[in-house]
């Protein structure tokens, strides 16, 4: 595998992260495959101090980030436990409100413009944020 | 200068076999993410496959899921596509195209001659 | 599935016309759109991206224009290299998808 040691261009580097910060709109899976096209994910959010370094770098706009809840549960994309790890949700949030008219509920979790977070239609487009870990080997798969 | 030559086209007959090769060179191969796009004869493009540059996320059309296997060599900067139970519509020309990644999205800045596989019995 | 609609399906045109070539997404891409040229036997080349942005090298005769579902590739004077194929392209998301294409050929 090969390790990545600095951020690629236009990527911020934080924490031994890189992240990048989208200024248009997508769908949260199409935002989804675009961080993994990229060898990143859609962020997750572990600590007070992400939080306040992301919502600083989208500032009071609607923003996808990695956790939705369309198998049943809460879930990360990247694997980090939801039920034991940091939330920062809206009160009385999420709600899986089925009253936009849409269709279904809602599984997709966003920023919104106070920073705080909120479950929403992930069809709906909004930004995003990429993340990827610095000094991760990235495993390449066995070459058949 | 980026360069990137395709191999491995060739006359197969239907369910059988064929690995497709991408040797590129000219720009940091295993920072960037590739795809593979046919063509069938007189007829438009069609995008295949796509992968990332550490080879850990691939992407495929419906019309070759399960069929088809993209993946990558970094050491030796190339692009392969393993393509098994060939039909005859999969007859076409196959590019290897680079990506690139732009305010957001990914389109396909350089393109491959293009290797030829047919499928016949 | 996206699907990309192109027209018109071919175009005639002499050197120094004024050539438009519209695509029409199945639903709202954004500006995710790419526009390539082709020549018989040859592989696609990248013309515009983002739907307005010049790929490095491209004359500047060429431009993309358009948001949304509806966009526009336009030559502002033909000349005798652009004869060719053109295809518009969405990479708003997978599978990424291909209008028809429009083949520019001389009147």
């Known amino acids: 595998g090969s390790e990545r040691t600095c951020c690629p261009v236009n990527w911020v580097e934080h924490e031994r992260s890189c992240y990048w910060f989208s200024r248009s709109g997508k769908a949260w899976a199409d935002a989804d495959n675009y961080c993994r096209l990229e060898d990143a994910h859609l962020v997750v959010v572990t600590s007070w101090e992400e939080q306040k370094f992301v919502q600083h770098h989208i500032g009071p706009v609607n923003t996808w980030m990695g956790l939705h809840d369309q198998n049943g549960p809460w879930k990360w994309v990247d694997g980090t436990d939801y039920e034991t790890g940091f939330k920062n949700w809206r009160p009385e949030q999420p709600d899986d409100w089925y009253g936009h008219g849409l269709g279904g509920g809602e599984d997709c979790a966003h920023f919104t413009d106070d920073g705080r977070w909120n479950d929403d239609v992930c069809q709906r487009p909004y930004r995003w944020v990429c993340e990827t870990e610095l000094d991760k080997a990235s495993q390449e798969p066995p070459l058949l | 200068e980026v360069q990137l030559l395709e191999s491995g086209g060739d006359l197969i007959q239907p369910g059988g076999s064929l690995r497709l090769s991408c040797a590129a060179s000219g720009f940091t191969f295993s920072s960037s993410a590739m795809s593979w796009v046919r063509q069938a004869p007189g007829k438009g493009l069609e995008w295949v496959s796509a992968?990332?540059?550490?080879?850990?996320?691939?992407f495929y059309a419906d019309s070759v899921k399960g069929r088809f296997t993209i993946s990558r060599d970094n050491s030796k900067n190339t692009l392969y596509l393993q393509m098994n139970s060939l039909r005859a519509e999969d007859t076409a020309v196959y590019y290897c195209?680079?990506?690139?990644?732009?305010?957001?999205?990914?389109?396909?800045?350089?393109w491959g001659q293009g290797t030829l596989v047919t499928v016949s019995s | 599935d996206i699907q990309m609609t192109q027209s018109p399906s071919s175009v005639s045109a002499s050197v120094g016309d004024r050539v438009t070539i519209t695509c029409r997404a199945s639903q709202g891409i954004s500006s995710w759109i790419a526009w390539y040229q082709q020549k018989p036997g040859k592989a696609p080349k990248l013309l515009i991206y983002g739907a307005s942005s010049l790929q490095s090298g491209v004359p500047s005769r060429f431009s993309g224009s358009g948001s949304g579902t509806d966009f526009t590739l336009t030559i502002s004077s033909l000349q005798p290299e652009d004869f060719a194929t053109y295809y518009c392209?969405?990479?708003?998301?997978?599978?990424?998808?291909f209008g028809p294409g429009t083949k520019v050929d001389v009147k």
């Open positions: 392209q969405q990479s708003n998301s997978f599978p990424f998808t």
């Open positions: 195209a680079k990506l690139i990644a732009v305010v957001g999205s990914h389109y396909f800045d350089y």
């Open positions: 992968i990332s540059g550490s080879g850990g996320n691939t």
